[in-house]
Protein backbone atom coordinates (compact mmCIF):
# COMPACT_ATOMS: atom_id res chain seq x y z
CA UNK A 1 0.00 0.00 0.00
CA UNK A 2 1.48 3.35 -1.06
CA UNK A 3 0.45 6.78 0.17
CA UNK A 4 -1.04 9.45 -2.08
CA UNK A 5 -1.88 13.12 -1.48
CA UNK A 6 -5.58 14.09 -1.51
CA UNK A 7 -6.71 17.74 -1.45
CA UNK A 8 -10.15 19.08 -0.56
CA UNK A 9 -11.50 22.45 0.62
CA UNK A 10 -11.33 23.17 4.34
CA UNK A 11 -14.87 24.45 4.77
CA UNK A 12 -18.05 24.60 2.69
CA UNK A 13 -21.43 26.08 3.61
CA UNK A 14 -24.26 23.93 2.26
CA UNK A 15 -27.02 25.58 0.26
CA UNK A 16 -30.36 26.41 1.88
CA UNK A 17 -31.71 23.28 0.18
CA UNK A 18 -29.22 21.09 2.05
CA UNK A 19 -26.86 20.46 -0.86
CA UNK A 20 -23.06 20.67 -0.63
CA UNK A 21 -20.61 20.12 -3.47
CA UNK A 22 -16.84 19.98 -3.29
CA UNK A 23 -13.90 18.76 -5.31
CA UNK A 24 -11.64 15.99 -4.09
CA UNK A 25 -8.33 16.04 -5.99
CA UNK A 26 -5.72 13.31 -5.81
CA UNK A 27 -2.11 13.31 -6.98
CA UNK A 28 -2.11 10.14 -9.06
CA UNK A 29 1.42 8.78 -9.30
CA UNK A 30 0.55 6.53 -12.25
CA UNK A 31 -2.13 5.77 -14.81
CA UNK A 32 -4.91 4.25 -12.71
CA UNK A 33 -7.86 2.79 -14.58
CA UNK A 34 -10.00 1.83 -11.61
CA UNK A 35 -10.55 4.26 -8.72
CA UNK A 36 -12.61 3.97 -5.56
CA UNK A 37 -13.83 7.08 -3.76
CA UNK A 38 -15.30 6.93 -0.26
CA UNK A 39 -16.76 9.81 1.75
CA UNK A 40 -16.42 9.46 5.52
CA UNK A 41 -18.05 11.72 8.11
CA UNK A 42 -16.30 12.53 11.36
CA UNK A 43 -18.35 14.12 14.12
CA UNK A 44 -17.70 13.98 17.85
CA UNK A 45 -14.81 11.51 17.27
CA UNK A 46 -17.11 9.04 15.49
CA UNK A 47 -16.32 8.14 11.87
CA UNK A 48 -19.04 6.75 9.61
CA UNK A 49 -19.14 5.97 5.90
CA UNK A 50 -21.47 8.29 4.00
CA UNK A 51 -21.12 6.81 0.51
CA UNK A 52 -18.68 5.10 -1.83
CA UNK A 53 -18.28 4.55 -5.55
CA UNK A 54 -15.86 2.69 -7.78
CA UNK A 55 -15.38 3.99 -11.30
CA UNK A 56 -13.32 3.34 -14.38
CA UNK A 57 -11.33 6.37 -15.52
CA UNK A 58 -13.34 8.35 -18.06
CA UNK A 59 -16.64 6.92 -16.84
CA UNK A 60 -19.28 8.34 -14.52
CA UNK A 61 -19.22 7.60 -10.80
CA UNK A 62 -21.99 5.23 -9.83
CA UNK A 63 -23.20 5.35 -6.26
CA UNK A 64 -25.91 3.05 -4.93
CA UNK A 65 -29.46 4.05 -5.91
CA UNK A 66 -30.36 5.17 -2.39
CA UNK A 67 -27.11 7.09 -1.87
CA UNK A 68 -27.19 10.75 -0.83
CA UNK A 69 -24.08 11.29 -2.97
CA UNK A 70 -23.61 11.93 -6.66
CA UNK A 71 -20.42 12.74 -8.47
CA UNK A 72 -18.50 13.25 -11.66
CA UNK A 73 -14.83 12.71 -12.44
CA UNK A 74 -12.41 14.62 -14.60
CA UNK A 75 -8.82 13.50 -14.67
CA UNK A 76 -7.55 13.38 -11.09
CA UNK A 77 -10.51 15.32 -9.72
CA UNK A 78 -13.78 14.03 -8.35
CA UNK A 79 -16.63 16.52 -7.96
CA UNK A 80 -18.80 15.23 -5.13
CA UNK A 81 -22.30 16.40 -4.27
CA UNK A 82 -24.04 15.42 -1.05
CA UNK A 83 -27.76 16.17 -0.78
CA UNK A 84 -30.51 15.92 1.78
CA UNK A 85 -28.33 17.48 4.46
CA UNK A 86 -29.76 18.93 7.66
CA UNK A 87 -28.16 20.93 10.49
CA UNK A 88 -27.52 17.71 12.42
CA UNK A 89 -25.36 16.50 9.51
CA UNK A 90 -22.80 19.27 10.04
CA UNK A 91 -19.39 17.69 10.39
CA UNK A 92 -16.06 16.91 8.79
CA UNK A 93 -16.46 15.02 5.50
CA UNK A 94 -13.29 13.17 4.57
CA UNK A 95 -12.46 12.09 1.05
CA UNK A 96 -10.70 8.73 0.75
CA UNK A 97 -9.30 7.73 -2.64
CA UNK A 98 -7.98 4.29 -3.58
CA UNK A 99 -6.28 3.47 -6.87
CA UNK A 100 -7.43 -0.12 -7.28
CA UNK A 101 -6.01 -1.09 -10.66
CA UNK A 102 -3.45 -1.59 -12.04
CA UNK A 103 -1.06 -2.37 -9.17
CA UNK A 104 0.49 -0.99 -7.06
CA UNK A 105 -2.45 -0.09 -4.80
CA UNK A 106 -2.41 3.56 -3.65
CA UNK A 107 -4.39 5.03 -0.75
CA UNK A 108 -4.96 8.71 -0.02
CA UNK A 109 -7.05 10.36 2.67
CA UNK A 110 -7.82 14.09 2.67
CA UNK A 111 -7.84 16.37 5.72
CA UNK A 112 -11.58 16.69 5.44
CA UNK A 113 -14.08 19.37 4.45
CA UNK A 114 -16.15 20.86 7.25
CA UNK A 115 -19.64 20.99 5.78
CA UNK A 116 -21.83 23.41 7.70
CA UNK A 117 -25.58 22.97 7.26
CA UNK A 118 -28.29 25.38 8.34
CA UNK A 119 -31.88 24.19 8.52
CA UNK A 120 -34.07 26.59 6.52
CA UNK A 121 -36.34 28.91 8.45
CA UNK A 122 -39.88 27.46 8.56
CA UNK A 123 -42.18 29.23 6.10
CA UNK A 124 -44.82 31.43 7.73
CA UNK A 125 -48.29 29.87 7.67
CA UNK A 126 -50.25 30.89 4.61
CA UNK A 127 -54.02 31.36 4.33
CA UNK A 128 -54.47 28.74 1.65
Amino acid sequence: CKAMHVAQPAVVLASSRGIASFVCEYASPGKATEVRVTVLRQADSQVTEVCAATYMMGNELTFLDDSICTGTSSGNQVNLTIQGLRAMDTGLYICKVELMYPPPYYLGIGNGTQIYVIDPEPCPDSDF
Epitope: A10, V11, L13, A43, L92, G112, Q114, Y116
Partner: antibody
Framework: QVQLVQSGAEVKKPGASVKVSCKAS????????ISWVRQAPGQGLEWMGW????????NYAQKLQGRVTMTTDTSTSTAYMELRSLRSDDTAVYFC???????????WGQGTLVTVSS | EIVLTQSPGTLSLSPGERATLSCRAS???????LAWYQQKPGQAPRLLIY???SRATGIPDRFSGSGSGTDFTLTISRLEPEDFAVYYC?????????FGQGTKVEIK
Amino acid sequence: QVQLVQSGAEVKKPGASVKVSCKASGYTFNSYGISWVRQAPGQGLEWMGWISAYNGNTNYAQKLQGRVTMTTDTSTSTAYMELRSLRSDDTAVYFCARVGRHLAFAYWGQGTLVTVSS
Amino acid sequence: EIVLTQSPGTLSLSPGERATLSCRASQSVSSSYLAWYQQKPGQAPRLLIYGASSRATGIPDRFSGSGSGTDFTLTISRLEPEDFAVYYCQQYGSSPWTFGQGTKVEIK
Protein backbone atom coordinates in the same frame (compact mmCIF):
# COMPACT_ATOMS: atom_id res chain seq x y z
CA GLN B 1 1.93 33.33 6.83
CA VAL B 2 -1.81 33.90 6.93
CA GLN B 3 -2.78 37.58 6.92
CA LEU B 4 -6.07 39.45 6.72
CA VAL B 5 -5.76 43.16 5.97
CA GLN B 6 -8.83 45.36 6.23
CA SER B 7 -9.69 48.69 4.65
CA GLY B 8 -9.41 51.95 6.57
CA ALA B 9 -11.74 53.74 8.96
CA GLU B 10 -14.99 55.20 7.63
CA VAL B 11 -17.32 57.97 8.79
CA LYS B 12 -20.86 57.72 7.47
CA LYS B 13 -24.14 59.55 7.88
CA PRO B 14 -27.28 57.73 9.12
CA GLY B 15 -29.08 56.03 6.23
CA ALA B 16 -25.90 55.62 4.19
CA SER B 17 -24.08 52.39 3.33
CA VAL B 18 -20.57 51.20 4.07
CA LYS B 19 -18.47 48.52 2.37
CA VAL B 20 -15.50 47.11 4.28
CA SER B 21 -12.89 44.97 2.53
CA CYS B 22 -10.67 42.19 3.89
CA LYS B 23 -7.74 41.09 1.73
CA ALA B 24 -6.39 37.63 2.50
CA SER B 25 -2.93 36.25 1.80
CA GLY B 26 -0.81 33.27 2.80
CA TYR B 27 -3.39 30.55 2.12
CA THR B 28 -5.74 29.19 -0.56
CA PHE B 29 -8.52 31.76 -0.24
CA ASN B 30 -11.39 29.78 -1.75
CA SER B 31 -10.77 26.76 0.45
CA TYR B 32 -11.93 28.63 3.57
CA GLY B 33 -14.67 30.96 4.77
CA ILE B 34 -14.69 34.53 6.04
CA SER B 35 -16.77 35.61 9.02
CA TRP B 36 -17.53 39.16 10.12
CA VAL B 37 -17.72 40.20 13.77
CA ARG B 38 -18.33 43.66 15.15
CA GLN B 39 -17.66 45.35 18.47
CA ALA B 40 -19.38 48.53 19.57
CA PRO B 41 -17.30 50.89 21.74
CA GLY B 42 -16.76 49.32 25.18
CA GLN B 43 -18.98 46.35 24.30
CA GLY B 44 -18.55 42.66 23.56
CA LEU B 45 -18.25 40.75 20.28
CA GLU B 46 -21.25 40.37 17.98
CA TRP B 47 -21.26 37.79 15.16
CA MET B 48 -22.66 39.18 11.92
CA GLY B 49 -22.45 36.20 9.59
CA TRP B 50 -20.07 34.35 7.30
CA ILE B 51 -19.48 33.44 3.68
CA SER B 52 -18.01 30.28 2.21
CA ALA B 53 -15.42 31.52 -0.29
CA TYR B 54 -15.63 28.10 -1.94
CA ASN B 55 -19.19 28.49 -3.20
CA GLY B 56 -20.34 31.98 -2.14
CA ASN B 57 -23.08 30.68 0.17
CA THR B 58 -23.81 32.94 3.13
CA ASN B 59 -25.22 32.68 6.64
CA TYR B 60 -26.29 35.98 8.23
CA ALA B 61 -27.36 36.88 11.74
CA GLN B 62 -31.15 37.29 11.73
CA LYS B 63 -30.83 40.76 13.26
CA LEU B 64 -28.94 42.04 10.21
CA GLN B 65 -30.78 40.08 7.51
CA GLY B 66 -31.81 42.44 4.70
CA ARG B 67 -29.23 45.09 5.64
CA VAL B 68 -26.00 43.12 5.24
CA THR B 69 -24.39 41.51 2.20
CA MET B 70 -21.18 39.50 2.29
CA THR B 71 -19.32 38.72 -0.91
CA THR B 72 -15.93 37.47 -2.06
CA ASP B 73 -13.73 38.11 -5.06
CA THR B 74 -11.61 34.99 -5.48
CA SER B 75 -9.48 36.62 -8.20
CA THR B 76 -8.11 39.10 -5.63
CA SER B 77 -8.60 36.95 -2.48
CA THR B 78 -10.75 39.68 -0.98
CA ALA B 79 -13.92 39.49 1.10
CA TYR B 80 -16.40 42.35 1.41
CA MET B 81 -19.07 43.23 3.93
CA GLU B 82 -21.64 45.85 2.98
CA LEU B 83 -24.02 47.25 5.59
CA ARG B 84 -26.89 49.46 4.44
CA SER B 85 -29.30 51.88 6.11
CA LEU B 86 -26.73 52.70 8.76
CA ARG B 87 -27.84 53.81 12.21
CA SER B 88 -25.88 55.31 15.07
CA ASP B 89 -25.86 51.95 16.87
CA ASP B 90 -23.91 50.47 13.94
CA THR B 91 -20.90 52.46 15.13
CA ALA B 92 -18.34 49.76 15.87
CA VAL B 93 -15.05 48.16 14.96
CA TYR B 94 -15.72 45.57 12.25
CA PHE B 95 -13.44 42.53 12.11
CA CYS B 96 -13.09 39.86 9.46
CA ALA B 97 -11.84 36.43 10.50
CA ARG B 98 -10.98 33.24 8.66
CA VAL B 99 -13.35 30.32 9.12
CA GLY B 100 -11.24 27.17 9.08
CA ARG B 101 -11.69 23.43 9.12
CA HIS B 102 -12.68 23.48 12.81
CA LEU B 103 -14.87 26.59 12.18
CA ALA B 104 -13.29 28.67 14.97
CA PHE B 105 -11.61 31.97 14.04
CA ALA B 106 -7.86 31.39 14.16
CA TYR B 107 -6.92 34.45 12.08
CA TRP B 108 -8.37 37.96 12.32
CA GLY B 109 -8.07 41.23 10.46
CA GLN B 110 -6.87 44.31 12.34
CA GLY B 111 -10.38 45.80 12.47
CA THR B 112 -12.07 48.72 10.71
CA LEU B 113 -13.73 51.49 12.70
CA VAL B 114 -17.03 52.59 11.19
CA THR B 115 -18.52 55.69 12.77
CA VAL B 116 -22.13 56.61 12.01
CA SER B 117 -22.86 60.20 12.91
CA SER B 118 -24.96 63.03 11.58
CA GLU C 1 -30.58 31.26 19.50
CA ILE C 2 -28.12 29.81 21.99
CA VAL C 3 -27.31 32.34 24.70
CA LEU C 4 -23.89 32.02 26.35
CA THR C 5 -23.56 33.43 29.86
CA GLN C 6 -20.06 33.95 31.21
CA SER C 7 -19.18 34.23 34.86
CA PRO C 8 -17.85 35.99 36.73
CA GLY C 9 -18.08 39.32 34.91
CA THR C 10 -14.75 40.36 36.41
CA LEU C 11 -12.06 38.26 38.04
CA SER C 12 -9.47 40.05 40.18
CA LEU C 13 -6.35 37.94 40.65
CA SER C 14 -2.61 38.23 41.12
CA PRO C 15 0.08 36.92 38.75
CA GLY C 16 0.84 33.27 39.52
CA GLU C 17 -2.72 32.52 40.64
CA ARG C 18 -5.12 30.14 38.90
CA ALA C 19 -8.04 31.56 36.91
CA THR C 20 -11.23 29.62 36.27
CA LEU C 21 -13.70 31.12 33.82
CA SER C 22 -17.16 29.69 33.21
CA CYS C 23 -19.38 29.70 30.12
CA ARG C 24 -22.91 28.35 30.40
CA ALA C 25 -25.12 27.75 27.35
CA SER C 26 -28.92 28.08 27.27
CA GLN C 27 -29.06 24.85 25.21
CA SER C 28 -26.66 21.97 24.70
CA VAL C 29 -23.65 22.78 22.49
CA SER C 30 -21.63 20.10 20.72
CA SER C 31 -18.19 20.23 22.34
CA SER C 32 -16.71 20.17 18.83
CA TYR C 33 -18.07 23.67 18.34
CA LEU C 34 -17.08 25.76 21.35
CA ALA C 35 -14.14 28.18 21.38
CA TRP C 36 -12.43 30.62 23.74
CA TYR C 37 -10.79 33.92 22.72
CA GLN C 38 -8.59 36.46 24.48
CA GLN C 39 -8.84 40.15 23.66
CA LYS C 40 -6.65 43.02 24.78
CA PRO C 41 -7.60 46.70 24.37
CA GLY C 42 -7.22 47.94 20.80
CA GLN C 43 -6.49 44.47 19.43
CA ALA C 44 -8.37 41.80 17.54
CA PRO C 45 -9.39 38.72 19.53
CA ARG C 46 -6.98 35.78 19.62
CA LEU C 47 -8.13 32.17 19.44
CA LEU C 48 -7.04 30.17 22.49
CA ILE C 49 -9.17 27.01 22.47
CA TYR C 50 -11.40 25.38 19.86
CA GLY C 51 -13.47 22.21 20.06
CA ALA C 52 -13.87 22.95 23.82
CA SER C 53 -10.44 21.56 24.70
CA SER C 54 -7.99 21.80 21.76
CA ARG C 55 -5.33 24.47 22.11
CA ALA C 56 -4.83 26.67 19.05
CA THR C 57 -1.39 26.90 17.45
CA GLY C 58 1.14 28.75 19.58
CA ILE C 59 -1.03 28.90 22.72
CA PRO C 60 0.91 28.08 25.91
CA ASP C 61 -0.14 24.98 27.85
CA ARG C 62 -1.15 27.00 30.90
CA PHE C 63 -4.42 27.56 28.99
CA SER C 64 -6.82 24.62 29.01
CA GLY C 65 -10.47 24.14 28.12
CA SER C 66 -12.95 21.57 29.34
CA GLY C 67 -16.65 20.84 29.57
CA SER C 68 -19.54 19.52 27.53
CA GLY C 69 -23.27 20.01 27.05
CA THR C 70 -24.12 23.36 28.60
CA ASP C 71 -21.15 23.94 30.93
CA PHE C 72 -17.68 24.88 29.72
CA THR C 73 -14.59 26.12 31.52
CA LEU C 74 -11.40 27.92 30.56
CA THR C 75 -8.58 27.49 33.07
CA ILE C 76 -5.36 29.49 33.20
CA SER C 77 -3.14 27.48 35.54
CA ARG C 78 -0.72 30.27 36.51
CA LEU C 79 -1.49 33.81 35.44
CA GLU C 80 1.28 35.65 33.64
CA PRO C 81 1.26 39.48 33.38
CA GLU C 82 0.28 39.24 29.69
CA ASP C 83 -2.83 37.15 30.52
CA PHE C 84 -4.77 40.05 31.99
CA ALA C 85 -7.41 40.69 29.32
CA VAL C 86 -11.03 40.00 28.41
CA TYR C 87 -12.00 36.41 27.54
CA TYR C 88 -14.95 35.39 25.37
CA CYS C 89 -16.51 32.00 24.73
CA GLN C 90 -18.22 31.33 21.39
CA GLN C 91 -20.44 28.56 20.05
CA TYR C 92 -20.52 27.85 16.34
CA GLY C 93 -22.47 24.61 16.26
CA SER C 94 -25.90 26.17 15.88
CA SER C 95 -26.83 29.18 13.76
CA PRO C 96 -26.68 31.99 14.69
CA TRP C 97 -23.17 31.66 16.08
CA THR C 98 -22.98 33.51 19.37
CA PHE C 99 -20.45 34.93 21.84
CA GLY C 100 -20.66 35.23 25.59
CA GLN C 101 -20.60 38.73 27.06
CA GLY C 102 -17.00 38.31 28.25
CA THR C 103 -15.06 37.93 31.48
CA LYS C 104 -12.46 40.53 32.38
CA VAL C 105 -9.41 39.18 34.19
CA GLU C 106 -7.78 42.09 35.99
CA ILE C 107 -4.78 42.50 38.27
CA LYS C 108 -5.70 42.47 41.95
